[in-house]
């Protein structure tokens, strides 16, 4: 891990940019914990495997989460 620190958060900056669900490889939601006192959302993009920290408070990101969970519920039997 590049940063040695007592608080083990992942995100250095957060993005409010809308993300096309089709360009997503993976979406991780890391709940607040004793290691990092804030929710972190990390999107792994299909393009070059770029990982991007998303702003959990952003309207665009909340819409993305809804779209992804809707897509998942469609897929599950």
């Amino acid at each position: 891990v590049p940063l040695s620190r007592t608080v083990r958060c992942t995100c250095i900056s957060i993005s409010n940019q809308p993300v096309n669900p089709r360009s997503l490889e993976k979406l991780e939601i890391i709940p607040a914990s004793q290691f990092c006192p804030r929710v972190e959302i990390i999107a792994t993009m299909k393009k070059k495997g770029e990982k991007r920290c998303l702003n959990p408070e952003s309207k665009a990101i909340k819409n993305l989460l809804k779209a992804v969970s809707k897509e998942r519920s469609k897929r599950s039997p």
Partner: antibody
């Protein structure tokens, strides 16, 4: 427009302290990690310190660890560098720079916005 | 601690020529952590490339980055007069956390 403006530089004697400020405008400061980078006269770039968007992540170059402290006040859109026990080798132009949107410990988007710098001279 | 070496120290070329700048790391660096910057005299640096090969916003497509492991390259396909400057590579992820190379100066032949 997106802008970073440094202030607080000047001439200071070895062993003394100085606090640099960097005021941000034109973007949501509280969403971005911030850095201090310095450049000694006629030399290359040297990274000094980083602070995460919420102030939880901090990191320092070995050359300043224990002497310099990076901090931020998101309500004032301002980044700080408290420099103690200054040495002649700390003489440089000090730039503040913004970490790219979405950067994490897994993927680095570079320092995408820079201020014009403030000059610190440590001399007796 | 990862050390970055840039070569050549100075590159003397004419406008219209191709410039190839090298950045070598003392240990393997993830391409996710490699960036390139341009700096002109009296100015702040400007981000050109991140993730070893992705162009930053507003950077012309004559600038391209490539490489992996320990060897990375910045290529300027056709030098424009405004491209004569110092170029720095930078890596993120070791202690010290962010490291710049010593720079390559591209000057007019």
């Amino acid at each position: 427009q997106v802008q970073l403006v440094e202030s607080g530089g000047g001439v200071v004697q070895p062993g003394r302290s100085l606090r640099l400020s960097c005021t941000a405008s034109g973007f949501t400061f509280s969403d971005y990690g911030m850095h201090w980078v310095r450049q000694a006269p006629g030399k290359g770039l040297e990274w000094v310190a980083v602070i995460g968007y919420g102030g939880l992540i901090k990191g320092y170059a070995d050359s300043v660890k224990g002497r310099f402290t990076i901090s931020r006040d998101n309500s004032k859109n301002t980044l700080y560098l408290q420099m103690n026990s200054l040495r002649a080798e700390d003489t440089a132009v000090y730039y503040c720079a913004r970490e790219g949107a979405g950067s994490s410990i897994y993927y680095y988007y570079g320092m995408d916005v820079w201020g014009q710098g403030t000059t610190v001279t440590v001399s007796s | 601690e990862i050390v970055l070496t840039q070569s050549p120290g100075t590159l003397s070329l004419s406008p219209g020529e191709r410039a190839t700048l090298s950045c070598r790391a003392s240990q393997s660096v993830s391409s996710s952590y490699l960036a390139w910057y341009q700096q002109k005299p009296g100015q702040a640096p400007r981000l050109l490339i991140y993730g070893a090969s992705s162009r930053a916003t507003g950077i012309p497509d004559r600038f391209s980055g490539s490489g992996s492991g320990t060897d990375f390259t910045l290529t300027i396909s056709r030098l424009e007069p405004e491209d004569f400057a110092v170029y720095y590579c930078q890596q993120y992820g070791s202690s010290p956390i962010f490291t710049f190379g010593p720079g390559t100066k591209v000057d007019i032949k």
